[in-house]
């Protein structure tokens, strides 16, 4: 069977009883629609033993096998079984087109990988297979970050991809750290970007039939060293009832690696401050930003003793930042709590 615009077995009529194995070659990106049985009593489609769901990119629905856009992972054996029995109505294998031979001798040798020459596969100019992954044209990233540009494509013969920077061939040889090119993922990766990486990056995808290109713009934002920035309003003043659980949240933003501590202000000998003018505190939690849940302080089964001032303290190599909140703990059945005006419950 020669691949056409759409792989299709029509109409959805009762199949012949002489069920036989079929092999179909499908081009990448091509839609597939195969029928099995009458529409109202169509058989169930299975891939590699698993029944296909009626929804999704690859679906079995009312006797139809539908694939919106054929991908290499869709290749394999498909069976259609009659409803209510195990009678095989269709038994076919879908093969990815670009691993099969072509009838054109001038083709890229990459397409001559299958010596069995079972089917021919028409030439096709390059096309984008995942345009949704290319929607972000402008990449403005902080210096030191990793940047990845992608131009996933297909065609026959299998296209090649090359990259340009500001219109010139780009191999990354002058770039500290070089570049990473993954042809199978149609991607260019630059780690630890610097201002000199700014520019227009073009992917050029071409084969014997045609070519396509796409431009990405990279802007590298220079970092200005600063102490950690804490999100305004966090942690927030909170009122809780005895026995309940409380979470205090602190959002920290920092270029340099920050270190976070949760502190509870305490009273010693009737005083909240030492002779040095600094408050007395108890360290409740300490870790760096990469630790799981360090930005949340959990207080379980709170009691009256848990009431007081809590501080989120964040520091990096440049300096310290902190913000505080008050926790008010009320008795379980406090009549003033139920009678109080809503505004009185929380104080900022």
């Amino acid at each position: 069977l020669e691949a056409s615009e759409e792989v299709e077995l029509e109409p959805c009529l009762a199949p012949s009883l002489e069920q036989q194995e079929q092999e179909l070659t499908v081009a990448l990106g091509q839609p597939v629609r195969l029928c099995c049985g009458r529409a109202e009593r169509g058989g169930h489609w299975y891939k590699e033993g698993s029944r296909l769901a009626p929804a999704g990119r690859v679906r079995g629905w009312r006797g139809r096998l539908e694939i919106a856009s054929f991908l290499p992972e869709d290749a394999g054996r498909y069976l259609c079984l009659a409803r209510g029995s195990m009678i095989v109505l269709q038994n076919l294998t879908l093969i990815t087109g670009d691993s099969l031979t072509s009838s054109n001798d001038d083709e890229d040798p990459k397409s001559h990988r299958d010596p069995s020459n079972r089917h021919s596969y028409p030439q096709q100019a390059p096309y984008w297979t995942h345009p949704q992954r290319m929607e972000k044209k402008l990449h403005a990233v902080p210096a030191g970050n990793t940047v990845k540009f992608r131009c996933p494509a297909a065609g026959n013969p299998t296209p090649t991809i090359r990259w340009l920077k500001d219109g010139q061939a780009f191999h990354g040889e002058n770039r500290i750290g070089g570049i990473r090119l993954r042809h199978q993922h149609w991607s260019l990766v630059m780690e630890s970007v610097v201002p000199s990486d700014r520019g227009t990056y073009t992917c050029l995808v071409e084969n014997a039939v045609g070519s396509i290109r796409y431009n990405y713009l990279l802007d590298v934002l220079e970092r200005s060293p600063h102490r950690p920035i804490l999100q305004a309003g966090l942690p927030a003043n909170t009122t809780a009832v005895v026995g309940s659980d409380v979470e205090l949240l602190c959002k920290v933003y920092s270029d340099a690696q920050p270190h976070i501590q949760w502190l509870k202000h305490i009273v010693i000998n009737g005083s909240s401050f030492g002779a040095d003018g600094f408050p007395y505190v108890q360290v409740l939690k300490t870790a760096d930003i990469n630790s799981s849940e360090v930005e949340v302080l959990y207080l379980r089964n709170v009691s009256a003793e848990d009431a007081g001032e809590y501080t989120c303290l964040a520091g990096n190599s440049i300096g310290l930042s902190y913000q505080s909140a008050w926790l008010t703990v009320l008795p379980e059945e406090d009549p003033t709590w139920t009678a109080a005006a809503p505004e009185a419950r929380y104080t900022d």
Epitope: L71, P72, H130, T146, R182, H185
Partner: antibody, heavy 119, light 107 residues
């Protein structure tokens, strides 16, 4: 169906070498990038290395760079991991995994082979 | 390297509960994030790829969302077979780092 079968694990002394293999079947091996991922006892997953379908691209985790070498023989449908200068911290179950096309998601995994580095 | 931070590190839940696990990247990774499930003594299993795409054969109660630096895996109604460890993994940078894992236990 797709199958990946690792072998070559075992007990080795610190500083020693080991070569892991991963035999693949059920798919066109050369069409897929392959990775090694390891898991130390009781710990999480750690990506180790990747190689493109045609072998043109390889990359390694910093923790194994210069000591481990990933390779493949597409004629034998086999992926390899040559591990030299082994350390106690390399003790782990090593999995080979196939990458989805157009993505670096590991859609098929082997059952794993245990490498123990101890004197 | 890009760091991936999962939270919580463990959680207890009951069958039928809605469970949410979050994963934060140390920089923007677009939608280059995958989620895996691992049961004791078994290899991991791909659930979600590229942040929100359900892997073939995975029940629809699993869903993924997010882009940039913050991502979420949601199990809409926890089933007995869902008690396992869940990992996120970024593939934006050449080194495909995993999160430290979230253990989902029976309450």
């Amino acid at each position: 169906q797709v199958q990946l079968l690792e072998s070559g694990g075992g007990l080795v002394q610190p500083g020693g070498s080991l070569r892991l293999s991963c035999a693949a079947s059920g798919f066109t091996f050369s069409d897929y990038a392959m990775s090694w991922v390891r898991q130390a006892p009781g710990k999480g997953l750690e990506w180790v290395s990747v190689i493109e379908g045609d072998g043109s691209y390889t990359h390694y985790a910093d923790s194994v760079k210069g000591r481990f070498t990933i390779s493949r023989d597409n004629s034998k449908n086999t992926l390899y991991l040559q591990m030299n200068s082994l350390r106690a911290e390399d003790t782990a179950v090593y999995y080979c995994a196939r990458e989805k096309t157009y993505s670096s998601a590991f859609d098929y995994w082997g059952q794993g082979t245990l490498v123990t580095v101890s004197s | 390297d890009i760091q991936m931070t999962q939270s919580p590190s463990s959680l207890s839940a009951s069958v039928g509960d809605r469970v949410t696990i979050t994963c934060r990247a140390s920089q923007d990774i677009s939608s280059d994030l995958n989620w895996y499930q691992q049961k004791p003594g078994k290899a991991p299993k791909l659930l979600i790829y590229d942040a929100s795409n359900l892997q073939s054969g995975v029940p629809s109660r699993f869903s993924g969302s997010g882009s940039g630096t913050d991502f979420t895996l949601t199990i809409s109604s926890l089933q007995p077979e869902d008690f396992a460890v869940y990992y996120c993994q970024q593939h934006y940078s050449p080194s495909h780092t995993f999160g430290q894992g979230t253990k989902v236990e029976i309450k």
